[in-house]
Every structure is written in structure tokens, then in C-alpha cells.
């Protein structure tokens, strides 16, 4: 039975050219996290964090995705095209798969504030 919940940074905004932390947190379960996959809006792969092997950053993002903090990702040099949904998929044992969603809005405005609040989607 899956008892856990995924908490995410929810809806966040950040400045064009800046960086943002994409973070998910699995709580309320003792399940072991074996792997976390990070995907972009079109379900294309950003990165994999395997418990045994560490990080695999998808080649197209190597120059602007930094692993961490923790199981999260830091997306740098943001462009307007980065606006959209991001998904964290937690593969766990014995529970199975948990999935969280984050919506990132990249703003042109120089006064854009980076809002990053933890919430359950």
C-alpha cells in the first residue's frame, strides 16, 4: 500500500537568465528511494538520480543543469522556453512509483520574484 506523499515547490517563477531549484520531497513512507527521474513538460528527460550510481544528466542539458541540492535539480541560464511543467518521479521499494509536478514560469521582468513554496499538488 502506498502511504507516501510527494511535496513539491509547486508553482514557481524565476527571471530569464537566472536559475531555479526544482525540488520534490517524499514523506510519510519508509520506502527506500531507488531512483528519481526528472522530466520536462514534453516528458523529455532532464536527469536521473540513481541511488547506486548517482547522477546522469541528459546530454542536452549538461551545460545548464546542476545536480542537487539533494534529489533536486538546479536549472540555470533560464530561457522563456523553460516555462512549463516539470515532473519528479520517485521509484521506491516496496511502494512503487510516486510522481510530483512543478510549474515553472520564466519571466522577462527584471522585478520577477522567485517564489518557491513547498506544497502538496
Amino acid at each position: 500500500m502506498m502511504t507516501g506523499t510527494i511535496e513539491t515547490t509547486g508553482n514557481i517563477s524565476a527571471k530569464k537568465g537566472g536559475s531555479v531549484i526544482l525540488q520534490c520531497h517524499l514523506s510519510s513512507t519508509m520506502a527506500q528511494v531507488t531512483q528519481v527521474n526528472w522530466e520536462q513538460h514534453d516528458h523529455s528527460l532532464l536527469a536521473i538520480r540513481n541511488a547506486e550510481l548517482g547522477w546522469h544528466i541528459y546530454p542536452a542539458f549538461k551545460d545548464r543543469v546542476a545536480p542537487g541540492p539533494g534529489l533536486g535539480l538546479t536549472l540555470q541560464s533560464l530561457t522563456m522556453n523553460d516555462t512549463g511543467e516539470y515532473f519528479c518521479t520517485y521509484h521506491t521499494y516496496p511502494d512503487g512509483t510516486y510522481r510530483g509536478r512543478i510549474f515553472l514560469e520564466v519571466l522577462e521582468s527584471s522585478v520577477a520574484e522567485h517564489s518557491a513554496r513547498f506544497q502538496i499538488p
Epitope: 536521473i48 544528466i57 549538461k62
Partner: antibody
């Protein structure tokens, strides 16, 4: 002991297709990418594409799109590559190699020789 | 595509010598380079990953160096069993690309 066991040599007719296999032994199949590489004398090595059995992510070299199709069966820890519309240019040795992050293509299979001839 | 150039197609050396094989990338690939050895009739064997890290079980006479666009595989105290082809791979970006190879001949 980590092994990638590839299927045997193939002699095939032009215009037909061929499907070769790569069985992973000695490690967790779903943790690593499986890369496919073509080696032809005088042409060196060419990367065809890779597949991640732990999420079914697949990437192809543009040059091999429409030529190669990569699949994987996690129940048997086996990756497959099908080559279609074969010509003499497809005659080569095809290798599978596992990879992940920094460990790009660290272990290779013994290769499958494909000869296209009428 | 990133082009990996190994300008020396053949290199001749003697047992006990030191030899350096080079590989040049057409653009910055940081340290995402692997060096391989392939003996006749065999599949490639990884020697060095991330430009300078020896793979498990590789003798310490094999050393890798470089970053960015210029990479070197150095074999010190060459042994007769080192007769082989050596080639580099970049895995910084798709499509992954290989150097053309350098055949090491023992005098």
C-alpha cells in the same frame, strides 16, 4: 561478472531486416543505458543510439533514424536492435555497450557481425 | 556533431618506451572523454573515463589527461601486450562521437 552477451553473426539479403540481441548479465539491467555502436573497417565507430530500460528513454543518432529501432525487455534483461532496409553499407560489426553518467560505455558485448549480400 | 580527431593513425614504439596518443575535440567537451583499447578480433575495453580516471583493473602505466578540447592518453613502460588500436569517445553531447583511432605498433 559483468557481461553483455550478443547474438550470433547474420548473413542477410539486401532490402530485408535483421534483429539482434544483447543480454545483460551480472548487473541490474534497468540501472544502465544500453548503447549501440557500429564498427566498419576504414570507417571507425559510429554511435547509433541508446535506450534506458529503467524508463524506456530512447535516443537516436539522426543518421540512423529510420534505419535502427531500439527496444528492451526488462523481464529477460535483454536489449534489441532491429535494422531495416539493409544495404551493403550496413555490413559491419554491431556492439552493445552499457553506460551511465560518467561511466559512458564501460563494458561492451562481443559484437554481432552483419553481412548484407545477395 | 562534435568531431573527435586523432591525427596519428599509426604510432611505432619499443617495449619499455613511453608513448602519448592525442585526441582533439571540435568543441569544448569538458572532461566527458573515454579512452578505449581494442585488440585484434576483440571488443573495445575502457581504459580511462572522465579524461583522467583509470577504469577498474587497468594498469597504472595508462594515464589520461586533458580537458576542454585536447586530450592525451599516455602509456609509460610500453609492454608487448599493448599492441592494439586506441580511440577516444566524447559523451558530452548527442550524438556521441569517436576518434578515428591510433594503431600502436611495437618495434
Amino acid at each position: 561478472q559483468i557481461q553483455l552477451q550478443q547474438s550470433g553473426a547474420e548473413l542477410v539479403r539486401p532490402g530485408t531486416s535483421v534483429k539482434m540481441s544483447c543480454k545483460a548479465v551480472g548487473y541490474t539491467f534497468t540501472n544502465y543505458w544500453i548503447n549501440w555502436v557500429k564498427q566498419r573497417p576504414g570507417h571507425g565507430f559510429e554511435w547509433i543510439g541508446d535506450i534506458y530500460p529503467g524508463g524506456y528513454y530512447i535516443n537516436y543518432n539522426e543518421k540512423f533514424k529510420g534505419k535502427a529501432t531500439l527496444t528492451a525487455d526488462t523481464s529477460s534483461s535483454t536489449a534489441y536492435m532491429q535494422l531495416s532496409s539493409l544495404t551493403s553499407e550496413d555490413s559491419a560489426i554491431y556492439y552493445c555497450a552499457r553506460g551511465y553518467g560518467s561511466y559512458a560505455m564501460d563494458y561492451w558485448g562481443q559484437g554481432t557481425s552483419v553481412t548484407v549480400s545477395s | 556533431d562534435i568531431v573527435m580527431t586523432q591525427s596519428q593513425k599509426f604510432m611505432s614504439t619499443s617495449v619499455g618506451d613511453r608513448v602519448s596518443i592525442t585526441c582533439k575535440a571540435s568543441q569544448n567537451v569538458r572532461t566527458d572523454v573515454v579512452w578505449y583499447q581494442q585488440k585484434p578480433g576483440q571488443s573495445p575495453k575502457a581504459l580511462i573515463f572522465l579524461a583522467s580516471n583509470r577504469h577498474t583493473g587497468v594498469p597504472d602505466r595508462f594515464t589520461g589527461s586533458g580537458s576542454g578540447t585536447d586530450f592525451t592518453l599516455t602509456i609509460s613502460n610500453v609492454q608487448s601486450e599493448d599492441l592494439a588500436d586506441y580511440f577516444c569517445l566524447q559523451h558530452w553531447n548527442y550524438p556521441y562521437t569517436f576518434g578515428g583511432g591510433t594503431k600502436l605498433e611495437i618495434k
